[in-house]
Interface confidence: low
């Protein structure tokens, strides 16, 4: 709480407008107006993000009306900038306290359309860990006050487990809402159908979108698993590749391990399944592993988990950084 | 033209900016600023679309700093106004000349249910064929009897070569719109920004994207190549697997050539360039070959085009199917 | 350009039944497009009765259903209106109609000059 | 089903008047910011034709005197220099939600 003694000044951010035709200029003035205060030092930062920009202000020298004095400074930014969605704050230390006010992009007031998505259980989920989900995701939702209701049912009219909610906000405004329903691995198999329902009182109308196990051909895939030999400047670290190809259908998980441990999935970096000339699918793996590893253990195994595996729905290969040592 | 014995007003409009969320006040304030006049009677009238606001502005007192005169004039306006896409116009009377400054509501970025993309030309036209073009590419249009223009300019003004259009109708039923325009190399390594402007009847007003060379740090590409040892049932194909990694910028081109021709893109399949877990990128390419090819020369290259390599901007490794015969 | 043009209206008795034809030209049915039968009761208002997507999916009024079948001939470029159980508040032009789409939405950009249904006994 | 009342019913009006129709919706048709409400204008013994599409947005071949706006669940159309070709009824019309439906229309009439 400021002391009687003086008065507190008011921040206020202005922007440089865009033009009659709703374009941006090539750059936008943030304009920080700091007014009405007892005369006295006052210190003026930018931040953008949170922290605290390394910029040279054009601050115009204080003004005094009456016993109120007012100053302002200005930030200049590039269209790239501002279009990139971060928050510039105005920050005003005065008499030991600090006054702010922040802005960024107003948020598109017409944003894109909503979408969902119902994702199958993962195959490591349902044959390993034996305890598959799905999940209903809606992405591009304008933040509203009306409620974005998900609810579950199942073609067969059985009940359906309870669910998970989560919600999110993005970087552009929107709001991501996902639904996580964990399902019975035996109606999975035996096909049973799935369905998400999403209703917003901005929809137009509800939002259907269903899932079962996948239909046709069933093949296993085929595992290869390489390791780089060493490149100039980076003898302390390798990468691992592994192949997996020719099967059927897409849904797949992979893994990596080493010293029978199975590596962090932030680990490795593995593609979406992608079709092959023939009628089946591949995916590569990433794996960066470093010295200290393969010295403790020169062993990594890549290992696909899928239903057309067998045994146990799971193929792997081991691969070596040094193979003949 | 003003004549000499009086210094002309600038007129300049600013906004009240959205909050740090980026939400719209529950009202607007425009400010026009009427500065750096010859002191003397100045009449400021606010219209919308052209047509003028019987308002009730709050104008405050002009001020005199030196020789010069500035005055400005606050209109409020309520957010529902703003959002209506009307243009506010500060018109500004003096000396028996007019000035003025306009402005609306900025565009969305991102209006809904269209998105705009804007390529760069891929390395292989730039440095190998020496003719490199950019796309500009509008997905989610409803077909529509209202035409999508696609119109091209350059950050220097300088004339655009004729570009080539293509439209699909895709499975969704909505409507892809290509442009592609040819550029000179020149202009491209030297840093040209080019522009796509998407307009169409639907589209709440025009979509702006531009292109212009990667900034930032350089690094040539690793390149890694790899036979997968026969499977049984397959004796008669093999995959052959590219790993390239660890280049800056992501911009790249994957060829493979079999006795110095280069094979069809559409024998290849490659990613999408993915971030490693240090500052680069790195693709994977997967190529089948059949007995024949190996048999006709058992010698495959992988080839990435990419900036930063040296010489000729390529780097190239070569496999074999039998390595050892 | 697209046109279209109703057929097989008249007077028909209450109970009784009626097929309204809808010729297409300039425009293949199955292109694209969304197609309507919008009717018009004598001195009244508009009344949205079914629509054909190109697809060949098909949409109903509650207020019809049941009663009204729409269907089409690919080859003729023909969409129809098939009208059961005719009843004196069936009485009306009925109009066929191309309807835009815009992201899920349709409204009815190009009608046809509309045929009479009479029904009287 | 969402109802729409027109108002006025009819009204008379001469040449070079401006003129205002109303449509209210028993719910809102705005969706996204996208206004889901068209006005067509019938001439008797014709088709209607497309006016206004999206609560303001003309149909290419429309004279830029006739105009929509509004939002939610109020929307109005406005002549604003009525011609003698204008006479006519106007139907406002709500594509948010199926099934599609119509106002009751207002008849344009010559005072």
């Known amino acids: 709480v400021c002391s009687r003694d003086f008065t507190p000044p008011t921040v206020k951010i202005l922007q440089s407008s865009c033009d009659g035709g709703g374009h941006f200029p090539p750059t936008i003035q943030l304009l920080c107006l700091v007014s009405g205060y007892t005369p006295g030092t006052i210190n003026i930062t930018w931040l953008e993000d949170g922290q605290v920009m390394d910029v040279d202000l054009s601050t115009a020298s204080t003004t005094q009306e009456g016993e109120l004095a007012s100053t302002q400074s200005e930030l200049t930014l590039s269209q790239k900038h501002w279009l990139s969605d971060r928050t510039y704050t105005c920050q005003v230390t005065y008499q030991g306290h600090t006054f702010e006010d922040s802005t960024k992009k107003c948020a598109d007031s017409n944003p894109r359309g909503v979408s969902a998505y119902l994702s199958r259980p993962s195959p490591f989920d349902l044959f390993i860990r034996k305890s598959p989900t799905i999940t209903c995701l809606v992405v591009d939702l304008a933040p509203s006050k009306g409620t974005v209701n998900l609810t579950w049912s199942r073609a067969s009219g059985k009940p359906v487990n309870h669910s998970t909610r989560k919600e999110e906000k993005q970087r552009n405004g929107t709001l991501t809402v996902t639904s996580t329903l964990p399902v019975g691995t035996r109606d999975w198999i035996e096909g049973e159908t799935y369905q998400c329902r999403v209703t917003h009182p901005h929809l137009p109308r509800a939002l259907m979108r269903s899932t079962t196990k996948t239909s046709g051909p069933r093949a296993a895939p085929e595992v290869y698993a390489f390791a780089t030999p060493e490149w100039p400047g980076s003898r302390d670290k390798r990468t691992l590749a592994c192949l997996i190809q020719n099967f059927m259908p897409e849904d797949i998980s992979v893994q990596w391990l080493h010293n029978e441990v199975q590596l962090p999935d932030a680990r490795h970096s593995t593609t979406q399944p992608r079709k092959t000339k023939g009628s089946g699918f591949f995916v590569f793996s990433r794996l960066e592993v470093t010295r200290a590893e393969w010295e403790q253990k020169d062993e990594f195994i890549c290992r696909a988990v899928h239903e057309a595996a067998s045994p146990s729905q799971t193929v792997q290969r081991a691969v070596s950084v040094n193979p003949g040592k | 033209v003003c004549s000499r014995d009086f210094t002309p007003p600038t007129v300049k409009i600013l906004q009240s900016s959205c909050d740090g969320g980026g939400h719209f006040p529950p009202t607007i304030q425009l400010l026009c600023l009427v500065s750096g006049y010859t002191p003397g009677t100045i009449n400021i009238t606010w219209l919308e679309d052209g047509q003028v606001m019987d308002v009730d502005l709050s104008t405050a007192s002009t001020t005199q700093e030196g020789e010069l005169a500035s005055t400005q004039s606050e209109l409020t306006l309520s957010q529902k106004h703003w959002l209506s896409d009307r243009t506010y116009t500060c018109q500004v009377t003096y000396q028996g000349h007019t000035f003025e400054d306009s402005t609306k509501k900025c565009a969305d970025s991102n209006p809904r249910g269209v998105s705009a993309y804007l390529s760069r030309p891929s390395p292989f036209d730039l440095f190998i064929r020496k003719s490199p073009t950019i796309t500009c590419l509008v997905v989610d249009l409803a077909p529509s009897k209202g035409t999508v223009n696609l119109t091209w300019s350059r950050a220097s003004g300088k004339p655009v070569n004729h570009s080539t259009r293509k439209e699909e109708k895709q499975r969704n039923g909505t409507l892809t719109v290509t442009s592609t325009l040819p550029v000179g190399t020149r202009d491209w390594i030297e840093g040209e920004t080019y522009q796509c402007r998407v307009t169409h009847p639907h589209l709440p007003r025009a979509l702006m994207r531009s292109t212009t060379k990667t900034s930032g740090p350089r690094a040539a590409p690793e390149v890694y190549a790899f036979a997968t040892p026969e499977w049984p049932g397959s004796r008669d194909k093999r995959t052959l697997a590219c790993l390239i990694q660890n280049f800056m910028p992501e911009d790249i081109s994957v060829q493979w050539l079999h006795n110095e021709v280069q094979l069809p893109d559409a024998r290849h399949s490659t990613t999408q360039p993915r971030k490693t877990k240090g500052s680069g990128f790195f693709v994977f390419s997967r190529l089948e070959v059949t007995r024949a090819e190996w048999e006709q020369k058992d010698e495959f290259i992988c080839r990435a085009v990419h900036e930063a390599a040296s010489p000729s901007q390529t780097v190239q490794r070569a496999v074999s199917v039998n390595p050892g015969k | 350009e697209v046109q279209l043009v109703e057929s097989g209206g008249g007077l028909v008795q209450p109970g009784g039944s009626l097929r309204l034809s809808c010729a297409v030209s300039g425009y293949s049915i199955t292109s694209g497009h969304r197609w309507e039968w919008i009717r018009q009761a004598p001195g009244k208002g508009l009344e949205w009765v079914a629509s054909?997507?190109?697809?060949?999916?098909?949409n109903y009024n509650p207020s019809v259903k049941g009663r009204i079948t729409i269907s089409r001939d690919d080859s003729k470029n023909t969409f129809y209106l098939q009208m059961n159980s005719l009843r004196a508040e069936d009485t009306a032009v009925y109009y066929c109609?191309?309807?835009?789409?815009?992201?899920?939405?349709?409204?009815?950009?190009?009608w046809g000059q509309g045929t009479l249904v009479t029904v009287s006994s | 089903d969402i109802q729409l009342t027109q108002s006025p019913s009819s009204l008379s009006a001469s040449v070079g008047d401006r003129v205002t129709i109303t449509c209210r919706a028993s719910q809102s048709v705005d969706y996204h910011g996208d206004h889901y409400m068209n006005w067509y204008q019938q001439k008797p013994g014709k088709a209607p034709k497309l006016l206004i599409e999206?609560?303001?947005y003309l149909r290419s071949g429309v004279p830029s005197r006739f105009s929509g706006s509004g939002s939610g669940t109020d929307f109005t159309l406005t002549i604003s220099s009525l011609q003698p070709e204008d006479f006519a009824t106007y139907y406002c019309q709500q594509n948010a939600e199926d099934p599609y439906t119509f106002g009751q229309g207002t008849k344009v009439e010559i005072k």
């Open positions: 999206w609560g303001s």
């Open positions: 109609a191309r309807a835009t789409h815009y992201f899920g939405h349709h409204h009815f950009a190009v």
């Open positions: 054909i997507h190109y697809d060949g999916s098909t």
